[in-house]
């Protein structure tokens, strides 16, 4: 295999015109990589909007944070932050608003201490399965990560492969029970029509959960039980059009949870009943009283709180004989 | 015209060091990454090295890592590569070519005639 | 290391006739996979990236096909300049890796 030297450097904020002597010995500790900026006080190195289109190759190993925000990097390959000696100190790596659509196996390998991921508003028409545990083996070795940042990782349509989007990032998740130390992952702005119903029961660490802005019509097949230490469920402006009775007491029993529901297009008929109960009675709703219904038109901006018994009705089912075209 | 002129090849006794250069010509070498291919005497290719229009991402092949370094110089539209404890099997003609934007998904769209490196006691 | 199987590793043609060399990849390689011609004591040309795009100025006898670990380069009337060897090439990983080479003979 080939493998990526260091280009040793003597200033900290690098300038592209100077020249560097470039060696296959391990980086010096002041380096930087050119169109970066460097502290080595802060542990910090910065690479923001200079359109590099690959990791350098020469980061400090100093580094413990680490944004490469705002470039054209397209793909992360295997060990695209592997090097001699590691990166053993490198703990957040913030990767949004680089232009990859394609994030393979192992992409994440040896670094040790990363603790904070954000591949945030990154087209991944194609995420590998094992781009966080890094190997196919049914179980890996557990991934330190904590924080799994994900928003608006949706590629347009026409770049979409032949599978189902949430399924390829479920999978990426689940691979190898490597994220089960995962406290914090969000994934608003996604489009996701459904949450497969696998995935909240293999990170039991969760603590912060954010599916905000998807297209989510319904919990019914996602089960919260196993998320004893969930403080935080996320679900602002999604489609979602009632919550039922067993999503209902699922979320009650979770001793820490607040839950956001704002901006759901909630449908104010009998199957509304049970909820609208719950929503007076509990504490987990944050904002509950801005919640209002979208349908039937009759309902619109009613505020689900005021509502009673009386007021959620359904119209009732014609037999076939008597239904019109 | 757009180039490649390779320079610097010659016989060395194993052990020893050579230094290539390539000068480009006709096009914004600042803006293209470059890299090193060989071919030993009637054999096939064989990639040696790659480095980014900034010099902040290099690679090497595992045959030639820790004894060969590539650099580049965009002041004077100039590539080298600096090879040191040479072995009998690094006899080969050796030429620069013109990469994309990233080693990965790129394609080399011009090379350069190329420069015979000899290893021989 | 991704190893490139080119075959044949010769073939004997006449001008005119349809000629297909294959390339296989030990792993998926997606789409990217180049293709070279070399002519003795010359330094290669590009003539096919990404699998199927014709670099500029290569004549459109030759196309190319495939992807994932099989590709196919294949020129659709050979002429007396196409007699050459011709090498296959992946730019999917690290190290970067060329075929063996094919080279096409006068019949």
């Known amino acids: 295999s080939s493998s990526p030297t260091s280009s040793a450097s003597s200033f900290s904020s690098s300038a592209p015109f100077l020249a560097s002597a470039v060696s296959a010995q391990p980086p010096l500790p002041d380096q930087c990589p050119a169109l970066c900026e460097c502290s080595e006080a802060a542990r910090t190195v910065k690479c923001v909007n200079r359109n590099l289109t690959e990791v350098p190759t020469d980061l400090p190993a100093y580094v413990r944070n680490l944004f490469l925000t705002g470039n054209q990097l397209a793909v992360l390959p295997a060990g695209a932050f592997a090097r001699r000696p590691p990166l053993a100190e490198l703990a957040a790596l913030n990767l949004s608003g680089s232009r990859l659509d394609e994030v393979r196996a192992g992409a994440f390998e040896h670094l040790p201490s990363l603790r904070q991921l954000d591949l945030s508003h990154n087209p991944l028409a194609d995420l590998s399965p094992f781009a966080f545990s890094g190997s196919n083996a049914s179980v890996s070795a557990p991934s330190p990560l904590v924080e799994l940042i994900l928003n608006h990782i949706v590629p347009p349509e026409d770049e979409r492969q032949n599978r189902s989007f949430e399924g390829m990032v479920v999978a990426a998740l689940l691979a190898g029970r490597a994220l089960q130390g995962l406290r914090r992952l969000e994934l608003a702005s996604n489009h996701f029509l459904y949450l497969p119903r696998d995935v909240l029961a293999q990170l039991p660490s969760l603590r912060h959960l954010d599916l905000s802005n998807n297209s989510l019509v319904s919990l019914t097949y996602v089960s919260f039980r196993n998320l004893t230490h969930l403080e935080s469920l996320h679900l602002e402006d999604n489609a979602l059009k009632v919550l039922h009775n067993g999503t209902l007491a699922e979320l009650q029993g979770l001793p820490h949870i607040r839950v956001f529901l704002d901006n759901n297009p909630w449908v104010c008929d009998c199957h509304m009943a049970d909820m609208v109960t719950w929503l007076k009675e509990t504490e987990v709703v944050q904002g509950k009283d801005r919640l209002t219904c979208a349908y039937p038109e009759k309902m619109r901006n009613r505020v689900l709180l005021e509502l009673n018994s009386a007021d959620l009705d359904c119209d009732p089912i014609l037999p076939p004989s008597l239904q019109t075209s | 015209e757009v180039q490649l002129v390779e320079s610097g090849g010659g016989l060395v006794q194993p052990g020893g060091s050579l230094r290539l250069s390539c000068a480009a010509s006709?096009?914004?070498?600042?803006?293209?990454?470059m890299n090193w291919v060989r071919q030993a005497p009637g054999k096939g290719l064989e990639w040696v090295s790659y480095i980014n229009s900034v010099s902040n991402t290099i690679y090497y092949a595992d045959s030639v890592k820790g004894r060969f370094t590539i650099s580049r110089d965009n002041a004077k539209n100039s590539l080298y590569l600096q090879m040191n404890s040479l072995r009998d099997e690094d006899t080969a003609v050796y030429y620069c070519?013109?990469?994309?934007?990233?080693?990965?998904?790129?394609?080399?769209?011009?090379w350069g005639r190329g420069t015979l490196v000899t290893v021989s006691s | 290391d991704i190893q490139m199987t080119q075959s044949p590793s010769s073939l004997s043609a006449s001008v005119g006739d349809r000629v297909t060399i294959t390339c296989r990849a030990s792993q998926t390689i997606s789409s990217y996979l180049n293709w070279f011609q070399q002519k003795p004591g010359k330094a290669p040309n590009l003539l096919i990236y990404t699998t199927s795009i014709l670099q500029s100025g290569v004549p459109s006898r030759f196309s190319g096909s495939g992807s994932g670990t099989d590709f196919t380069l294949t020129i659709s009337s050979l002429q007396p300049e196409d007699f050459a060897t011709y090498y296959c090439q992946q730019s999917y990983s690290t190290p970067l890796t060329f075929g063996g080479g094919t080279k096409v003979e006068i019949k």
């Open positions: 070519a013109r990469g994309g934007v990233r080693v990965l998904r790129s394609y080399f769209d011009l």
């Open positions: 006709g096009f914004t070498f600042s803006s293209y990454s």
